[in-house]
């Protein structure tokens, strides 16, 4: 009643091995790392089987099959390309994520590479089985920020591209007669999130109430250069309008809000977020130079009080910017204490501009970034948002614009953005 | 999560000084401010100062000015509140606290107090 | 200094009830009070901040409202853990002052 010898199957063993098997021993076939057990289309770790009565086996040896991990999983905003030669998917073969660049930037900066492991999963070292993350690269324009610019009073052409981040925000309030319509700047943080100034999208209402613009009113339009060509933009409504709940219409502290998009904006060349600054009380150093950009009043013959008068929205067709250093707090203080009005320089505020004049941000600016360049990060960083200025026209002497302190609000940025309330997908690679 | 862990009571005679502890820990140390607080026995909050281990600024009220010094031990995330020439009107619970968020000082994480107890 | 005046030392209610804690400031604070909630031998705990934002974990009960220098606190179904007093703060500016307190009693 002894039963043939067996051959163990290619890639594969038998337990016990013997020089003869009676009936009732048991065999257990099993494959080398990397392999399966192939019986009747099933696949399985290791399969048993008996010396029959008669002599016979219970069962044929199976095959080891080699372990294939299948088509890899695609990846958002990125792509996968096979090391191993014919795109192997089987075990020790190789993948290599990659993320779009230069809009796309893999997150923790992993290498990317995956190989198809014993148990059938593309695995990589530090994420195991978890797909990378490419999240928006920040404050990179795929066009160079020149150094000098001359004399948005003072200001000149950006040229498209240079400030990707920079969204026009448009508010039109269909529910007053006449119908009420203004706008302003924003600057992307994500593909889903604008970043501007509180009172460009509080509803402009005769008391001081602070109420949010109903969502319904909002238009924001991305990769703008020249408002009367719309064509190439990319324009998006809100899903959500959220201002800063302390912000003051008195003294526009706090003055800094979000509106998350309907969906998320493409990313490219005229598309592309600007970085959030590291959470600091001091913000900007004085003298510091920063960008600002904006589609506001150029015309530096024009005073507020004019335009106010007049009724008309003036502003720029064609992206204007501006360079201007950072005012040291106390200066600015001075220079708003020594003026009639109750003016408020807070913690919350910086100031930039020139003593002399001839170069500002101004109406129709508001809620535009105020960029510098991190040196250590090599990233533009969004440290201010045009927020307000004297009664004198723009670019007056003496007169610095004021600016909301981002830095101070980076927490609060980040838990509206990851909010139960919110979309998903927030982060940003700084 | 975010705690704010305060050192014990203290009894100390008038005319005399008294320094108490606050051990941060569940947050970056110095990404907020410290502010701390008097309480009465069955009295309301006074605000005494705040101090940002940042840049170990600190604000203090008018009213405490030369009465508290704010100082700070980055490496134990410590902030401490020396109070001098004690009266026995200083007897007090004094808490110290932190914000939700950098630019609202309203105070979301409270310590557990120090109990100061002005008596010959 | 901003003065912060809650002129009911003590409110008497019943479980069920509604309860409406008042605050004033003696000058605009725009929407920068806090309100908290203190129990005997207790740390203060954050209840309202912007006048009118629940902060996180607070039942739904506790409502703020009011802007400028009015505000209320609202507990619209009391509980018998709602014992306690409870105080206003403003943070608009440069000393953060707290109103005097008012202690809930429940009948």
């Known amino acids: 009643n002894e039963c043939p010898k067996l051959q163990p199957p290619v890639y594969g063993k038998i337990e016990p091995s013997q020089a003869v098997y009676s009936f009732k021993d048991q065999v257990l076939v099993s494959c080398d790392t990397g392999y399966k057990v192939l019986k009747d289309n099933g696949v399985m770790d290791t399969f048993q089987i008996e010396c029959l009565k008669d002599g016979a086996w219970s069962n044929k040896i199976p095959t080891c099959k080699i372990v294939d991990c299948g088509a890899p999983a695609g990846l958002k905003h990125g792509l996968v390309t096979f090391s191993t030669r014919n795109n192997l998917t089987t075990y020790k073969s190789e993948i290599r994520y990659s993320c779009q660049q230069p809009y796309y930037k893999m997150l923790h900066n992993t290498t990317g590479v995956y190989t198809c492991s014993a148990h059938g999963t593309w695995t990589n070292e530090v994420l195991k089985r978890s797909l990378p993350t490419c999240l928006p690269v920040c404050g990179q324009p795929s066009r160079a920020l020149p150094n000098l610019v001359k004399r948005i009073i003072g200001g000149r052409n950006a040229e498209l591209g240079l400030f990707p981040w920079q969204a026009l925000i448009v508010v039109e309030d269909t529910s007053r007669v006449p119908n009420d319509k203004w706008f302003g700047s924003g600057a992307l943080l994500s593909e889903s999130w604008i970043l501007t100034a509180a009172h460009v999208l509080r509803s402009q209402r005769r008391d001081n109430t602070v109420i949010p613009v109903s969502k319904e009113h909002v238009t924001v339009y991305l990769g703008l250069h020249d408002v009367r060509d719309k064509s190439g933009a990319v324009n998006s409504s809100a899903a959500r309008v959220i201002l800063h709940p302390d912000f003051n219409i008195q003294n526009y502290n706090h003055d800094i809000a979000l509106v998350q998009l309907q969906k998320p904006v493409p990313l490219g060349a005229h598309v592309m977020p600007i970085c959030l600054p590291r959470p600091e009380p001091e913000g900007p150093a004085p003298h510091m130079l920063g960008l600002v950009a904006g589609w506001g009043i150029s015309n530096p013959n024009v005073t507020v009080d004019e335009i106010i008068l007049s009724g008309t929205r003036t502003l720029s067709d064609v992206l204007q910017y501006v360079k201007l250093p950072v005012v040291s707090h106390a200066e600015c203080k001075a220079s708003y204490e020594s003026r009639s009005g109750n003016y408020s320089v807070t913690e919350n505020m910086f100031c930039a501009g020139y003593y002399e004049g001839g170069k500002d941000t101004c109406l129709g600016d508001s809620g535009g970034a105020f960029v510098i360049f991190d040196e250590m990060s090599q990233h533009w960083v969004a440290q201010g948002l045009v927020s307000w200025g004297g009664p004198e026209e723009c670019g007056s002497k003496q007169v610095y614009g004021v600016y909301t302190k981002v830095s101070n609000y980076v927490d609060w940025l980040w838990e509206e953005m990851n909010s139960p309330r919110a979309v998903r997908d927030l982060q940003v690679e700084r | 999560q975010v705690q704010l862990k305060q050192s014990g009571a203290e009894l100390v005679k008038p005319g005399a000084s008294v320094k108490m502890s606050c051990k941060a820990s569940?947050?970056?140390?110095?990404?907020?401010?410290i502010e701390w607080m008097k309480q009465n026995h069955g009295k309301s909050l006074e605000w005494i100062g705040n101090?940002?281990?940042?840049?170990?600024?600190?604000k203090y009220n008018e009213k405490f000015k030369g009465k508290a010094t704010l100082t700070v031990e980055k490496s134990s995330s410590t902030v401490y509140l020396e109070l001098s020439r004690l009266p026995s009107a200083d007897s007090a619970i004094y808490y110290c606290?932190?914000?939700?968020?950098?630019?609202?000082?309203?105070?979301?994480?409270w310590g557990q107090g120090t109990l100061v107890t002005v008596s010959s | 200094d901003i003065v912060m005046t809650q002129s009911q030392k003590f409110m008497s209610t019943s479980v069920g009830d509604r309860v409406n804690v008042t605050c004033k400031a003696s000058q605009n604070v725009g929407p920068t009070v806090a309100w908290y909630q203190q129990k005997p031998g207790q740390s203060p705990k954050a209840l309202i901040y912007s006048a009118s934002y629940r902060y996180s974990g607070v039942p739904d009960r506790f409502t703020g409202s009011g802007s400028g220098t009015d505000f209320t606190l609202t507990i619209s179904n009391v509980h018998s853990e709602d014992l306690a007093e409870y105080f206003c703060?403003?943070?608009?500016?440069?000393?953060?002052?707290f109103g005097s307190g008012t202690k809930l009693e429940i009948k």
């Open positions: 606290a932190r914000r939700h968020y950098a630019a609202s000082p309203w105070f979301a994480h």
């Open positions: 101090f940002h281990p940042y840049n170990g600024d600190s």
């Open positions: 703060q403003q943070y608009n500016s440069y000393p953060f002052t």
């Open positions: 569940g947050y970056t140390f110095t990404t907020y401010p």
